[in-house]
């Protein structure tokens, strides 16, 4: 019989139901925006906006200050008062649409849904390690703004994304707003604009550059701005918008818009379609070629990547990569495949594709029929012509007009569909040591911290825990403060360490010490923890072996038993080769001699499952007593593995030494030709791992083995004669003298 240790699922080494409590702040209303500030003198702050209020928190998430930002028209509105005596516009609640830092000052800028979407500038006043907001400045000059020309109207009630860039001695606000006909008619916000904050903070400079969805498309063509960021020489906006101006407006796709961060101009505004797909390793019949499209971006973040992921993406370590979480449609849930997929777009590659697209449009020979695109922003035209013109005039350049790049950038899910039913709603990527970690918030209020690698068929979790009991979705925007990330869910802000909330979810010593170095996990006797949790016994250098099972559960008191031990931390080496003298197994008082691993039996174990096997030959000592006893495995002097060395003892109860007894054999005769079915009756006949019935020294082929009975078929006899019959268990003869008589056939 070839008994094998049962596989232990990889998931059994961790428990994602472990409760972690992380610092939190209750904002008193749904969190609408959040941003963090870290000064150069150890002062820091978290700014949290809810309807009609802006909270200033210290680095410990304790409230430092609170400011009333609405309702507009209410005498208690502190920001409104900065604009002088009103009325300034229709009364109403202020929902914060923009909350950004102008790091050059430093100052916080907030813009709301009320008062024509105007903004307020709050200078930061360091006070010890905390920060206070100075009296707000109203970034609005009443006599400069009209409904048809309003440089100080920034925020759209439908959503606005802002990235602040310092150019020269000025701050430029790169603004992208969602519009519809009603919003566009009211103080004319623009879809995309670059606005310079005036040095005296009286508002934004007039005559700013802008692009807007053309009036005829405003009803049917809506653009959602999901994310914006600045890296290198460019500012990028990520959008979800209809794939076509003319076709079904519900057929959406994702685009990246690129603007120059060094020149406040929109002539080199470029768009590129981002295509993210789930391509399972084994394609289902009927599944689309190239994988299932996930066209709708839900969240995004850009970050420099660690060495391992950089290698997999064929880029240099530390290069910036845009990560996006995509879904199949606005409602999120697909028919087949995972709910969310994650695609990685290296920024350098994005820029190269855009530059190649410009060459295709502007360098001869230009492919006939190649459109400039962006027909929702500008008059249709063919390359290389400027928008709305039949031909280039001598003093215009093809390159100085907005362009949609004709090819898309296609990527496949980094997680190979392993996110499964998880609906990711927030994303922040960090580089820790050589590792790139995705910190994800989910629809059901959990945080998943997972290493970003593409070559595996399982997820490498740093953690997976519930933020609180509310189960509300984690919001899109995540901020970093020192070694923590701030996530918002419902009316709460949570502070999550980038190294993970703890180590208690790792259940085994091996899993604990294999955790990433940055997590600071160590083994504390019987649990995984950080040093501060168990200073006494905490260590990171060794694990005891762990016995989980053995086979068989009984063996003969006389004779040997081949014992198979199951568990973990036996070898730390896939080959399972054991150096001489390192492993000691005792069963009761008796030693069990280690057996060399049978290489023919070695088989690859998928990493999702794990088990180690160890075989030894048990020869009971003469002093060994019958009855139940323990199996003990002690490992010493093992050379260290990659993560730790094995050292220690594991004991498991449940082995019994037994004495087999043979009580009866029948029939006692049979034909010389053999084939007689012998029945041997007794006790403990099935103990151990080997048994043999010998008829005149030749094995009687066992047909059935049970505790009280053995059945076997006699071998042919040489002559008609009475011959000895014996039973051996574990190579030792069971007491008793029996004969079998061969007769003529």
């Amino acid at each position: 019989e070839d008994w094998q240790c049962p596989r232990t699922p990889y998931a059994a080494s961790r428990d994602f139901d472990v409760k972690y409590v992380v610092p939190s702040f209750s904002a008193g209303g749904l969190v609408q925006a959040m941003v963090t500030y870290e000064g150069d003198r150890n002062e820091s702050a978290v700014f949290v906006a809810i309807r009609n209020r802006l909270h200033v928190l210290g680095p410990d998430l304790k409230s430092v200050q609170s400011l009333a930002t609405g309702p507009a028209g209410d005498p208690g509105c502190q920001t409104c008062a900065a604009c002088g005596p009103g009325p300034h516009g229709p009364p109403g609640d202020t929902d914060t649409k923009v909350l950004v830092l102008d790091p050059a000052l430093p100052a916080l800028v907030s813009c709301g849904s009320s008062l024509q979407g105007r903004c307020f500038l709050h200078d930061l006043e360091p006070q010890g390690t905390a920060v206070h907001l100075a009296a707000p400045a109203c970034l609005f000059s009443a006599h400069h703004n009209r409904p048809d020309d309003c440089p100080d109207c920034v925020a759209s009630p439908l959503g606005t994304r802002v990235t602040v860039v310092e150019q020269g001695q000025a701050s430029y606000f790169y603004v992208a707003s969602s519009l519809d006909a009603a919003v566009a008619a009211s103080f004319s916000p623009r879809s995309v604009s670059i606005r310079r904050l005036k040095a005296d903070a009286s508002g934004f400079a007039p005559g700013f550059v802008a692009l807007s969805v053309l009036p005829k498309h405003l009803v049917s063509y809506s653009i959602e701005y999901v994310h914006s960021f600045h890296t290198g020489a460019f500012v990028y906006f990520l959008t979800v918008q209809p794939a076509s101006v003319t076709d079904d407006p519900s057929a959406l796709h994702t685009r990246l818009a690129r603007l120059s961060a060094t020149e406040p101009e929109l002539g080199d505004y470029r768009e590129l379609v981002l295509d993210c797909r789930f391509a399972p390793k084994r394609r289902r019949r009927g599944a689309p070629e190239g994988g299932q499209p996930y066209p709708v971006l839900r969240v995004a973040h850009s970050a420099p990547v660690g060495a391992q992921l950089a290698t997999e993406l064929s880029i240099a370590e530390g290069q910036e990569v845009l990560f996006g979480v995509f879904v199949t449609g606005k409602d999120g849930g697909p028919g087949v495949g995972p709910n969310s997929v994650v695609c990685a777009f290296p920024i350098d590659l994005l820029d190269t594709l855009i530059d190649e697209g410009v060459e295709r449009c502007c360098e001869s020979p230009v492919h006939p029929g190649l459109r400039r695109g962006l027909d929702f922003f500008q008059s249709p035209s063919f390359c290389p012509n400027p928008p709305g013109l039949e031909a280039l005039s001598p003093n215009t350049s093809c390159r100085h007009f907005p362009l949609l790049v004709s090819s898309s950038f296609s990527r496949v899910d980094l997680f190979n569909g392993l996110l499964g039913p998880v609906q990711v709603t927030a994303l922040y990527v960090t580089r820790l040591d050589n590792v790139t970690v995705a910190h994800m918030g989910t629809m059901d209020g959990r945080i998943l911290q997972v290493e970003l690698v593409r070559s595996l068929n399982y997820l490498l979790y740093v953690s997976n825990f519930s933020l609180g009991d509310s189960g509300q979705p984690v919001q899109r925007d995540v901020s970093r403060l020192g070694d923590h990330l701030l996530f918002a869910s419902g009316d709460q802000v949570f502070q999550v360490p980038i190294q993970g909330p703890g180590c208690r979810h790792f259940l085994t010593c091996g899993r604990c010490l294999r955790a990433w170095h940055f997590m600071g996990c160590g083994w504390c006797g019987n649990m995984c923890g950080q040093q501060k949790e168990c200073p006494g016994s905490w260590q990171q250098d060794h694990c005891p072996p762990k016995l989980t099972e053995f086979h068989p559960h009984s063996g003969p008191l006389r004779g040997s038993t081949r014992l198979t031990l199951c568990g973990s931390n036996f070898y730390l080496h896939p080959s399972g080769l054991v150096p001489e003298g390192t492993h000691q197994v005792t069963v009761g008082q008796s030693p069990c001699r280690p057996l060399p691993k049978d290489s023919s039996k070695l088989r690859p174990v998928p990493r999702k499952d794990f088990v180690e096997e160890f075989e030894c030959e048990l020869e009971p000592l003469g002093t060994q007593a019958v009855g139940p006893t323990n199996v003990s495995l002690t490992v010493t002097n093992m050379p260290p593995g990659k993560h730790f060395r094995v050292d220690g003892t594991s004991v498991l109860r449940g082995f019994s030494f037994m004495e087999p007894v043979l009580i009866a054999v029948q029939p006692l005769f049979g034909p010389r030709a053999g084939g007689t079915c012998l029945t041997l009756e007794g006790q403990s006949l099935s103990v151990g791992t080997s048994r043999a019935v010998l008829v005149n020294g030749t094995e009687c082929l066992l047909a059935r083995v049970s505790e009280g009975q053995l059945l076997c078929a006699t071998p042919p006899g040489a002559t008609v004669a009475s011959v000895p019959l014996s039973l051996q268990v574990g190579g030792a003869q069971v007491p008793g003298s029996w004969t079998f008589q061969y007769r003529e056939d």
Epitope: A104, L105, P106, A107, L121, D123, L124, E125, A134, A137, H143, H144, G168, Q169, A170, R196, K198, A199, D200, A201, S202, A205, P206, G207, F208
Partner: antibody, heavy 116, light 109 residues
Amino acid sequence: EVQLQQSGPELEKPGASVKISCKASGYSFTGYNMNWVKQSNGESLEWIGDIDPYYGGTRYNQKFKGKATLTVDKSSSTAYMQLKSLTSEDSAVYYCAREGRGFAYWGQGTLVTVSA
Amino acid sequence: DIQMTQSPASLSASVGETVTITCRASENIYSYLAWYQKKQGKSPQLLVYNAKTSVEGVPSRFSGSGSGIQFSLKINSLQPEDFGSYYCHCQHHYGTLPTFGGGTKLEIK
């Protein structure tokens, strides 16, 4: 390249008026306020006032109200400062400087001498 | 109006020395402070703005610090071309008009 080109030196009699100019190039003239700064011989710098070329709005240092008048001509991207009722106290170098967090761009200065 | 008090009014130092000029505002001006170098017959040159942001092209030996009411400009390892006058300047910011300090004349020893 941003440049501010000022008019040449002026010699005026007490009681007279003078109008000095500052022609801007290399940027969008209407997008930035223009500031005027005075430096008397051996003295510190004094901010006179500024003008918003887009809307024409002005602000003055209290000390120069009634003394200086700031105007612009958008078509020629030129800012002007007129000083009236000149006295010897007005003898100085006058600079135009483009708005910014700190004035990074300055004209070369116009020397105004008031002498009988 | 905000007053800017600069000290010392004059200072002599040798090439290679490090010098510090300070500026005090009569009220909190946050980080809205600029420093200029002014040489005879030349326009002022912006060195630092927002109290500590160095202007591109300005040698790294010039550095600004401070916030609120107390500010300083430090010049490491003085070079012959560094001699001249230095002015602090309360930048234009919300509700506040620009004001210059009285200046510091840095002379060669």
